[in-house]
């Protein structure tokens, strides 16, 4: 799987999942958010040869067109397979809060 | 929606879906498919400016971070989202078999 | 330059519904927290509610609740207040403006404001 | 709720001098969570002071805001023509967000 157990651990070119700390202040302008003061959010890169973790039939098709047909500009690209919450705390005020972000942080990839 | 009715009828550049007609037995080397001798599969590109077509928050974060820090590598990408079967025929010996591939054909994209 | 370009006047009968809209322009609009303030005629003013873009994190006045809708489309850069079982007391011009950047904080830039009149 | 009884409910000055509006909360508010507006007929507020003190960019020096726990005052040291409008203290300490019942600054 092209998870961060893989792709953290390895000199991966292809399609992985790559390390990126996100500060919510500096790098979004999100004042609102208390703690934590960042994330590692992540993100996929990468190229995806014919068959590396093809996400549906027309990825496989697209990589096998690719392959045989490499002046060809359509080819699958690396993006989210698995994604998870991140748990914050915000203020109401002087009321503090706690709330979970859904599909924040990239745990794997695929070639979709 | 970054579909085929808007995409297809607009110069667009940024993601969308684009038509790619495959030829099973030039494109692929699939000699087995009797019917239809190729197919509109279609293809995903373009880039994913801010908040076009966000899948998921994390990528309405990525998109986010790479509007506020421009030199970043991390962007989303654009990629399949609605996909539909594709009905072929091929034969077994001499029996004609009817199946429908699903995932086969792009009617619309998203960024993720 | 910053700008918040809301809908036009409306009328509306008693016990229907009214949806506000109000575009961003100028910044980054889901590094903002954007709230809804009302004003009705010749009275103070009065916060109703407000929301965090992208993850549509809202925040309401408890005599607001039930009745008010706060909600933001990022794609597009606009927030929505949609105000139900409207009574004649609701009659009054209603207001987005930019926080400063927390959930409740000071509000630095409004709206041009938007009469709701509500009359059988 | 924090109620804000803002005083006095009208404030009749002559251009030149200087106004210093009043505004009580019901509850101490610490000393960061007021903002001060001021508006005028037929147009949105507009932010003068947040954090009880600090000014908003492009607001005239003239303006300035004091205060901490349940008393905060608006001074206006000296006043001009455009300065005559209604004022509302705004408080975001808790919720809801309340605002004071506003003092007119009229010529006198």
């Known amino acids: 799987a092209l998870d961060t157990n893989y792709c953290f651990r390895n000199l991966e070119e292809n399609c992985c999942v790559r390390p990126l700390y996100i500060d919510f202040r500096q790098d979004l302008g999100w004042k609102w958010v208390h703690e934590p003061k960042g994330y590692y959010a992540n993100f996929c890169s990468g190229p995806c040869p014919y068959l590396r973790s093809a996400d549906t039939t027309h990825s496989t098709v697209l990589g096998l067109y690719n392959t045989l047909n490499p002046e060809a500009s359509a080819s699958p690209c690396c993006v989210p397979q698995d994604l998870e919450p991140l748990t914050i705390l915000y203020y109401v005020g002087r009321t503090p809060k706690v709330e979970q972000l859904s599909n924040m942080v990239v745990k794997s990839c695929k070639c979709s | 929606a970054l579909d085929t009715n808007y995409c297809f009828r607009n110069l667009e550049e940024n993601c969308c879906v684009r038509p790619l007609y495959i030829d099973f037995r030039q494109d692929l080397g699939w000699k087995w498919v009797h019917e239809p001798k190729g197919y509109y599969a279609n293809f995903c590109s373009g880039p994913c400016p801010y908040l076009r077509s966000a899948d998921t928050t994390h990528s309405t974060v990525l998109g986010l971070y790479n509007t506020l820090n421009p030199e970043a590598s991390a962007s989303p990408c654009c990629v399949p989202q609605d996909l539909e079967p594709l009905t072929i025929l091929y034969y077994v010996g001499r029996t004609p078999k009817v199946e429908q591939l699903s995932n086969m054909v792009v009617k619309s994209c998203k960024c993720s | 330059q910053v700008q918040l370009v809301q809908s036009g006047a409306e009328v509306k009968k008693p016990g229907s519904s009214v949806k506000v809209s109000c575009k961003a322009s100028?910044?980054?609009?889901?590094?903002?927290?954007i709230s809804w303030v009302r004003q009705a005629p010749g009275q103070g003013l009065e916060w109703m509610g407000g929301?965090?873009?992208?993850?549509?994190?809202?925040n309401y006045a408890q005599r607001f609740k039930g009745r008010v809708t706060i909600t933001a489309d990022e794609s597009t850069s606009t927030t929505y207040m949609e105000l139900s079982s409207l009574r004649s007391e609701d009659t009054a011009v209603y207001y987005c403006?930019?926080?400063?950047?927390?959930?409740?904080?000071?509000?630095?830039?409004w709206g041009q404001g938007t009469l709701v009149t509500v009359s059988s | 709720e924090t109620v804000l009884t803002q005083s006095p409910g009208t404030l009749s000055l002559s251009p030149g001098e200087r106004a210093t509006l009043s505004c009580r909360a019901s509850?101490?508010?610490?000393?960061?969570?007021l903002a001060w507006y001021q508006q005028k007929p037929g147009q949105a507020p507009r932010l003068l002071i947040y954090?009880?003190?600090s000014r908003a960019p492009g607001i005239p020096d003239r303006f300035s805001g004091s205060g901490s726990g349940t008393d905060f005052t608006l001074t206006i040291s000296r006043l001009e023509p455009e300065d005559f409008a209604v004022y509302y203290c705004?408080?975001?300490?808790?919720?809801?967000?309340?605002f004071g019942q506003g003092t007119r600054l009229e010529i006198k």
């Open positions: 403006a930019s926080t400063l950047g927390l959930v409740l904080d000071a509000m630095d830039y």
């Open positions: 100028g910044y980054t609009f889901v590094s903002n927290v």
């Open positions: 929301v965090i873009p992208i993850v549509d994190i809202a």
């Open positions: 509850q101490s508010l610490g000393s960061s969570y």
């Open positions: 954090g009880a003190s």
């Open positions: 705004q408080q975001y300490a808790d919720s809801p967000i309340t």
